[in-house]
Interface confidence: medium
């Protein structure tokens, strides 16, 4: 069977006026997954995103990540989109005072 990913979105200061937002998917099986950043609901171009390899996490499941740099104050326009084994979910960037947003997708 399939194991749905845990999705976790974090933010970190990059440079003045910019932040890096990272979307991590973990503990999923099988390894095929779509993970991408979207602006206004539409996927960003590949050259503005950085992807991690899909790696085994030691429990028979997998993990990966995608990151992009965005302008501070525009966070609400960005979401992380995940698609795995026919299920999908959308994950917002957490506000500045809350650094984590995670969701186990069923």
């Amino acid at each position: 069977g399939s194991v749905p990913p845990m999705v976790n979105v974090t933010r970190s200061e990059a440079s003045e006026g910019n932040i890096t937002v990272t979307c991590r998917a973990s503990s999923f099986y099988p390894r095929n997954i779509t993970l991408t950043w979207r602006q206004d609901g539409v996927s960003l171009s590949h050259d503005t995103q950085q992807w991690g390899d899909v790696l085994p996490d030691g429990n028979g499941t997998y993990q990966t990540w995608v990151a992009t740099r965005i302008c501070q104050g525009e966070e609400q326009r960005f979401t992380c989109y995940m698609e795995h084994s026919g299920n999908h979910s959308t994950h917002p960037v957490p506000s500045g005072n809350s650094h984590h947003h995670h969701h186990h997708h069923h």
Epitope: S43, S45, T79, Y81, P92
Partner: antibody, heavy 122, light 112 residues
Framework: QGQMQQSGAELVKPGASVKLSCKTS????????ISWLKQKPGQSLEWIAW????????SYNQKFRDKAQLTVDTSSRTAYMQLSSLTTEDSAIYYC???????????????WGRGTLVTVSA | DVLMTQTPLSLPVSLGDQASISCRSS???????????LEWYLQKPGQSPKLLIY???NRFSGVPDRFSGSGSGTDFTLKISRVEAEDLGVYYC?????????FGGGTKVEIK
Amino acid sequence: QGQMQQSGAELVKPGASVKLSCKTSGFTFSDNYISWLKQKPGQSLEWIAWIYAGTGGSSYNQKFRDKAQLTVDTSSRTAYMQLSSLTTEDSAIYYCARHDYYGTSGAWFAYWGRGTLVTVSA
Amino acid sequence: DVLMTQTPLSLPVSLGDQASISCRSSQHIVHSNENTYLEWYLQKPGQSPKLLIYKVSNRFSGVPDRFSGSGSGTDFTLKISRVEAEDLGVYYCFQGSHVPWTFGGGTKVEIK
């Protein structure tokens, strides 16, 4: 696919405000972007703004920034648009529509409500 | 704003004819992610618009294959291979690549 149920017709006086609703069912509300559009009788369509139901984040057509305010209530799965300082120019049918961004689709207004007629008259 | 210009304004057809509607944008409508978000909608009298074509040439679910979209850059076309009675109404092109998203003025397809 799901449903988009819009509120009934409104007759309002110039200068007043009105709040239109778009109640949804049959899909994961918080995953979706919902847009509002305006159509005057016999004319084309204008996009007003979208709102992302997951966070309440929104983006506006600059033309409508001082006219429209979008909100969502996730508990009732309803999107709202408040129109303020109404004039006869605001008389139109207002539609809500759901975006379809899943997979490779990338379709803007895939599913529509039936529209709400707003008439501004003294 | 991107201006979307449709021609013709009115298109009289006989049932079974091929119909062709043109849409020209005032600038290139390629999104920064390299997709072209050009769509076509049909609005029948007294109804909400319905999506026919997205991303220039992709038919939306349930749309008959007699509808086809093509084009690139600033020039786009919707073709109906054999017009049926249920195809009558106003057709709008739309661009979602640049904010504010904008519609064409519409083309009314009616019986000759």
